[in-house]
């Protein structure tokens, strides 16, 4: 009689994570008497996956009824496959012996590879805001995918970026892999509405890539431009001076008026006008009582934006000699002339 052969017909099986894997095994004979076991890996460190007669294997079911007389099919199904299940599985016939059963013959092995989807890409930007013309870095991370082959692309407003570095870890064989990419983006004044996108393509995604996004609004700070002007007189003894704060982002802004270096009023920007590019404008005004001044007045509009160092613009409000003599009677003769910032 021919000696028993253990036949594992498939050299390899590929399964998507979460599915069941069927590993096929058949014997050519019922003799010798003894159990069948499945192992992952070979040698002393091999892991027992299924024992026909004993052990707890809740994820494993047999394809056929092993206790049926003359059964020669010892195929198994492993449920809820994860990347950790990848490896080579051996169907092994044992011969009953004393004290322990003796390994009689092994199948050639079936390599189980697990296709696992990458996690949703997480894109994170710089910890601190930067101003236009500066370069900021964005990172993109995704984990848990298998096999290792993966493609990552960066886009800014739909345009593909080229300045990025990508690593897939670990370098050697693993049950699953992670990808980490860093892209460098040069900010422009119009980037408040811009987006960067990290796009990942993998065999498990069937041509429908995963995308992670980040808004440049979280990374950019557009500093304001200041313009101080005098508006038409409201009354003969008053000068109406405005400070136009333009094209700033983000919103947080505090403005202080100084008269000859002394704080006159501080206010926090509230009702802002939003520009098409996402930046904001705001205007503040100051009524100067010219009759209270005998000398020229230096008015300063000082703006602290987004916690940064204050910027300011100063103007000299000239009090004419005639006005100095007659006080409020000649308020209208006062003139506003710009000076260099303080």
């Amino acid at each position: 009689e021919d000696e028993l052969q253990v036949i594992q017909p498939e050299k390899s099986v590929s399964v998507a994570a979460g599915e069941s894997a069927t590993l096929r095994c058949a014997m050519t004979s019922l003799i010798p008497v003894g159990p069948i076991m499945w192992f992952r890996g070979a040698g002393a460190g091999r892991e027992l996956i299924y024992n026909q007669k004993e052990g707890h294997f809740p994820r494993v079911t047999t394809v056929s009824e092993l206790t049926k007389r003359n059964n020669l099919d010892f195929s198994i199904s492993i449920s809820n496959i994860t990347p950790a299940d990848a490896g080579t599985y051996y169907c092994v016939k044992f011969r009953k012996g004393s004290p322990d059963d003796v390994e009689f013959k092994s199948g050639a092995g079936t390599e189980l590879s697990v296709r696992a989807k990458p996690s949703a890409p997480v894109v994170s930007g710089p910890a601190v805001r930067a101003t236009p013309e500066h370069t900021v870095s964005f990172t993109c991370e995704s984990h848990g995918f298998s096999p290792r082959d993966i493609t990552l692309k960066w886009f800014k407003n739909g345009n593909e970026l080229s300045d990025f570095q990508t690593n897939v870890d670990p370098a050697g064989d693993s049950v699953s892999y992670s990808i980490h990419s860093t892209a460098r983006v040069v900010l422009t004044r119009g980037d408040v509405h811009s987006q960067v996108i990290c796009e990942i393509a993998h065999i498990t995604l069937q041509g429908d890539p995963l995308r992670g996004t980040a808004n440049l609004s979280e990374a950019i700070r557009v500093p304001p431009t200041l313009e101080v002007t005098q508006q038409p007189m409201r009354a003969e003894n008053q000068a109406n001076v405005t400070c136009q704060v333009s094209n700033f982002y983000p919103r947080g802004l505090q403005l202080t008026w100084l008269e000859n270096g002394n704080v006159s009023r501080t206010e926090t920007a509230s009702t802002l006008i939003e520009n098409k590019d996402g930046t904001y404008n705001w205007m503040s005004w100051l009524l100067v009582n010219t009759c209270a001044h005998r000398d020229d007045v230096v008015l300063t509009c000082q703006v602290e934006h987004d916690g940064q160092q204050a910027v300011s613009k100063s103007y000299a409000l000239e009090i004419s000699a005639h006005q100095k003599e007659h006080g409020s009677d000649i308020t209208h003769e006062a003139a506003l002339a710009p000076t260099a910032p303080l």
């Epitope: 460190g45 007669k53 004993e54 052990g55 707890h56 294997f57 004290p99």
Partner: antibody, heavy 114, light 108 residues
Framework: EVQLQQSGVEVVQPGASVKLSCTAS????????MHWVKQRTEQGLEWIGR????????KYAPKFQGKATMTADTSSSTAYLQLSSLTSDDTAVYYC???????WGQGTTLTVSS | QIVLTQSPAIMSASPGEKVTLTCSAS???????LYWYQQKPGSSPKLWIY???NLASGVPPRFSGSGSGTSYSLTISSMQAEDAASYFC?????????FGGGTKLEIK
């Protein structure tokens, strides 16, 4: 539902023999080894041995060789443990356990006393 | 035969405390064949952890198992009153199969 139903309390004389039974339901007894475990009051667990009901082949812990005999009747889905030459040291709870290790009988209390 | 030595034999822990029970084997045991049981007075033992680190059905996730070779452990991350019981390690790597002497875990 998988169940292992064991025989009731046994009180026997020293020197006598006793045969404990374990009837399986909810699965084919031939598909698994059947193990027997001893537990003395407030003590640990001792593995006595296991039997393959399919062919009657069995393994024993050295300590129970000659003391215990395991048999199985597939037609009634019942495993048996016979203990001979009983002494007070055999007073214990005896459990049958399915080979997958998660199903245990409720235990049979054996008291050896004159 | 493989002798399994459990320590401590008896221990008590406060609710919320981290508990580690150890099981030392006299010779190497493959991790696939090292199981843990929980037993409460008057009840049959319950399979608690199988193949060193896999929790049996219904076992709370505060339990975990680890180890290899001759050194194995069962850990409870945060002791609860219902965890008070005896715990036995068990090897079926080679005949004769053996149980550890058990650790009786009490609640303070």
């Amino acid at each position: 539902e998988v169940q292992l139903q064991q025989s009731g309390v046994e009180v026997v004389q020293p020197g006598a023999s006793v045969k404990l039974s374990c009837t399986a339901s909810g699965f084919n007894i031939e598909a698994y080894y059947m193990h027997w475990v001893k537990q003395r009051t407030e003590q640990g667990l001792e593995w006595i041995g296991r039997i393959d009901p399919e062919d009657g082949e069995s393994k024993y812990a050295p300590k129970f060789q000659g003391k215990a005999t395991m048999t199985a009747d597939t037609s009634s889905s019942t495993a048996y443990l016979q203990l001979s030459s009983l002494t007070s040291d055999d007073t214990a709870v005896y459990y049958c356990v399915r080979g997958s290790y998660e199903y245990w009988g409720q235990g049979t209390t054996l008291t050896v006393s004159s | 035969q493989i002798v399994l030595t459990q320590s401590p034999a008896i221990m008590s822990a406060s609710p919320g405390e981290k508990v580690t029970l150890t099981c030392s084997a006299s010779s190497s045991v493959s991790s696939s064949y090292l199981y843990w049981y929980q037993q409460k007075p008057g009840s049959s033992p319950k399979l608690w952890i199988y193949s060193t680190s896999n929790l049996a059905s219904g076992v709370p996730p505060r339990f975990s198992g680890s180890g290899s070779g001759t050194s194995y452990s069962l850990t409870i991350s945060s002791m609860q009153a219902e965890d008070a019981a005896s715990y036995f390690c068990y090897q079926w790597s080679s005949y004769p199969y053996t149980f550890g002497g058990g650790t009786k875990l009490e609640i303070k």
